[in-house]
């Protein structure tokens, strides 16, 4: 069954998907696609890359890590409810059925907005007196009561980067892996 | 998928208040947010409100701030409305609605509470 | 907030047909539409999320599609027991808002 990755809305949401090239820069075909994988290719096709570089992708979805190395985890940019859902990571290895698929399953909740701590030094100091926020409905900006109107997508966006800086590192040991070569 | 089980009906007086309850069964109950909504006959349905059972965290329409309170008891796997400082348009029939396997937030209903606010 | 436009208001229809309703939203809402049915007296029943999937146990004659700010409910073949109130609802922001119903009789 699937491995199950969690988010918020306004978050990006990381799934994690590695191989191990045979050699330094020969790459593997690989495709990501929404829906579980089917038997051959990818369903619904969010991402895609060649031997050399990435061919194909939509707006949000895009790779964070060194693909060129193996790393093709994908991550998907301010998520919103309906962005839950199975993906699948297909490393398209050469020969007859070789492929590896690796179905992904992807929840994601409502936002949560809750006071800063007082330690998070780095993030208050650059929006003193105000709300952390993990996202509230990104269709459009929202503001925060009566703070200063303060743009809630900068925020996340700042707010993510951290994330994504720990999140990335803490998840690849958890992620779809395989050798090849 | 799982159950919820709202009372039938409930009859109140003018500026008094309400709890209405939505008993869930057959999932984990901590798992799911659960929604409230209003329907008025003519009136089309109204977004009340939602609540993360695991931790109490709730989402209000501003309409029903001061209107509405949301809470649970985890213990009996219930949500609750409280209504409070009851008037004629609060007379509605009142569901619970929790969301599905894949973030879906109105997938399964309860069968609803009809609020009767009456002198 | 969101302003969910559902039409038709009602419709009348034979068993075995194919209808179509519309919900446009005022601005774009990325999929984050939900369709719900109600039969008289009863309460709701989930039938799309996510602008396209199906709830469990929802026959596959009723499908969802659209993008950006318009959605359709499509019920292909009806049958006697699809006669009932049908509503969007979005979910991409707050507070989640409803369209105005549109009700399917038999004509």
């Known amino acids: 069954s699937e491995v199950e990755y969690r988010a918020e809305v306004g978050q990006n949401a990381y799934l994690p998907c590695f191989y191990t090239p045979a050699a330094p820069g020969n790459l593997v075909p690989v495709c990501w696609g929404k829906g579980a994988c089917p038997v051959f290719e990818c369903g619904n096709v969010v991402l895609r890359t060649d031997e050399r570089d990435v061919n194909y992708w939509t707006s949000r979805y895009w790779l964070n890590g060194d693909f060129r190395k193996g790393d093709v985890s994908l991550t998907i940019e301010n998520v919103t409810l309906a962005d839950s859902g199975i993906y699948c990571c297909r490393i398209q290895i050469p020969g007859i059925m070789n492929d590896e698929k690796f179905n992904l399953k992807l929840v994601i909740k409502p936002a949560k907005v809750t006071p800063a701590p007082t330690r998070q030094r780095d993030f208050t100091a650059a929006f003193p007196r105000m709300l952390t926020t993990r996202g509230h409905g990104p269709a459009e900006t929202q503001t925060l009561g009566s703070l200063p109107d303060i743009n809630l997508t900068q925020i996340s966006t700042l707010a993510n980067e951290l994330r994504d800086s720990r999140l990335a590192n803490d998840l690849r040991d958890s992620g779809a892996t395989i050798r090849i070569g | 998928q799982g159950q919820l089980q709202q009372p039938g009906a409930e009859v109140v007086k003018p500026g008094a208040a309400v709890k209405l309850s939505c008993k869930a069964s057959g999932y984990t109950f901590t798992s799911y947010w659960m929604q409230w909504i209003k329907q008025r006959p003519g009136q089309g349905l109204e977004w009340i409100g939602e609540i993360d059972p695991s931790d109490n965290y709730t989402d209000y329409n501003q309409n029903f701030k001061g209107k509405a309170t949301l809470t649970v008891d985890t213990s009996s796997s219930t949500a609750y409305l409280q209504l409070s400082s009851l008037t004629s348009e609060d007379s509605a029939v009142y569901y619970c609605?929790?969301?599905?396997?894949?973030?879906?937030?109105?997938?399964?209903w309860g069968p609803g509470t009809l609020v009767t606010v009456s002198s | 907030d969101i302003l969910m436009t559902q039409s038709p208001s009602s419709m009348s229809v034979s068993l075995g047909d194919t209808v179509s309703i519309i919900c446009h939203a005022s601005q774009d809402i990325r999929s984050n539409i939900g369709w719900l049915q109600q039969k008289p007296g009863k309460s709701f029943k989930g039938l799309i999320y996510?602008?396209?999937n199906l709830e469990d146990g929802v026959p596959s004659r009723f499908s969802g599609s659209g993008s950006g700010a318009d959605y359709s409910l499509t019920i292909s073949s009806l049958e006697s027991e699809d006669f009932a109130d049908y509503y969007c609802v979005q979910y991409v922001q707050f507070p989640r808002t409803f369209g105005g119903g549109t009700k399917l009789e038999i004509k």
């Open positions: 996510h602008g396209t």
């Open positions: 609605a929790k969301e599905g396997a894949f973030s879906s937030p109105f997938a399964y």
